[in-house]
Interface confidence: medium
């Protein structure tokens, strides 16, 4: 079920924090844990039974303005011989992250959060068959 | 920052690149998709490298709700079902954005964090190291 | 599995009052805001009251101050809202709901109960 948007804000503010319009909150875009780095192992994309390759989505109103995302390089899996085998399925695995979007009204800019799905990379799955009866 | 393509029209005081701080509206876009894996798809079920997924929940962060992958083996499932440890299940992981609370009480003021979620497993072929 | 289940609605008379209850599973509950929305016939959905964590703060919509009032018992997952004075206009489907840390976000709520006020 979705729920619709409710226009009320009701929190009280302690006094030390920053003055908020009301419908609005404060984002510092300076990331925490900017530097950390991910650690996978090496070209698994390439070694992978179920093969990706990336592609960078630039977008100069969205924060962070770089988003990565994986496409499935076949429909199969690549078998011990190295050839397709279609009796099995690459799939896309995804996960949601936050951006930052920044729109133009006019002259006026406006900031919104966003959730994005991102396709991380693929893995490889025993189809689900469908008998016709 | 980040370069912003700009109304000629509009005044040149306006900031070419992201400030540092934004005021954001507090709706946002998209947040009702389906956030929950196992309800999304059986992939970690069908998998050649399957995986559990842990829910790692904090309270003070946004979502609240986050879920890990973890590899169910170290080798893959063949065509027999059987664990194959000539191939590896190896975890994909992925940067994301959340919102933390800050200042920590402030229920108006955030900040994004980034942090390191693995999301699923896939099988890869291991790296031979031959010993001289 | 997250559940939030309502109970207590029902038929009462202009002036009347009701309790609802809410009982969660499936999360912290002592560590989560918790929040009553509703639901008018033909309305859109509106905020009622709100709950801290440990229940030293509430927050409520002006419309209901003075006549509804909020409570939890973390011990029993428990969220309550005692209704008073009950108006024909607070006719509506009352949901539970489990708050984010952004204010007026939920990410779970439950299937309402019904609050009916006629004569």
């Known amino acids: 079920r979705k729920i619709p948007k409710v226009g009320h804000t009701f929190f009280q503010k302690p006094e030390s924090c920053p003055p908020v319009p009301g419908g609005s909150m404060k984002l510092d875009i300076g990331i925490i844990n900017e530097n950390q780095r991910v650690s996978m192992s090496r070209n698994i994309e390439s070694r992978s039974t179920s093969p990706w390759n990336y592609t960078v989505t630039w977008d100069p109103n969205r924060y962070p303005s770089e988003v990565v995302q994986a496409q499935c390089r076949n429909l199969g899996c690549i078998n011990a011989q190295g050839k397709e085998d279609i009796s099995m399925n690459s799939v896309p695995i995804q996960q949601e992250t936050l951006v930052v979007r920044r729109k133009h009204q006019g002259c006026s800019v406006s900031f919104q959060l966003e959730k994005v799905l991102v396709t991380v990379g693929c893995t490889c799955v025993t189809p689900v068959i469908h008998h016709v009866q | 920052g980040i370069t912003i393509p700009r109304n000629p029209g509009c005044p040149n005081s306006e900031d070419k690149n992201f400030p540092r701080t934004v005021m954001v509206n507090l709706n946002i876009h998209n947040r009702n998709t389906n956030t929950n894996p196992k309800r999304s798809s059986d992939y970690y079920n069908r998998s050649t490298s399957p995986w559990n997924l842990h829910r790692n929940e904090d309270p003070e962060r946004y979502p609240s709700v986050i879920w890990e992958a973890k590899c169910r083996h170290l080798g893959c499932i063949n065509a027999d079902g059987n664990v194959d440890y000539h191939m590896n299940s190896v975890p994909i992981q992925q940067e994301i954005l959340v919102l933390r609370r800050e200042p920590p009480h402030c229920p108006n003021s955030f900040r994004l964090e980034k942090i390191l979620v693995s999301v699923g497993c896939t099988c890869v072929t291991p790296i031979v190291h031959h010993v001289a | 599995e997250v559940q939030l289940v309502e109970s207590g609605g029902g038929l009462v008379q202009p002036g009347g009052s009701l309790r609802l209850s809410c009982a969660a599973s499936?999360?912290?509950?002592?560590?989560?805001?918790m929040y009553w929305v509703r639901q008018a016939p033909g309305k859109g959905l509106e905020w009622v009251a709100n709950i801290k964590q440990d229940g030293s703060e509430k927050y409520y919509v002006d419309s209901v101050k003075g006549r509804f009032t909020i409570s939890r018992d973390n011990a029993k997952n428990s969220l309550f809202l005692q209704m008073n004075s009950l108006r024909a206009e607070d006719t509506a489907v009352y949901y539970c709901a489990k708050g984010e840390i952004l204010p007026l976000h939920f990410d779970y709520w439950g299937q309402g109960t019904l609050v009916t006020v006629s004569s």
């Open positions: 499936g999360f912290t509950f002592s560590s989560y805001s």
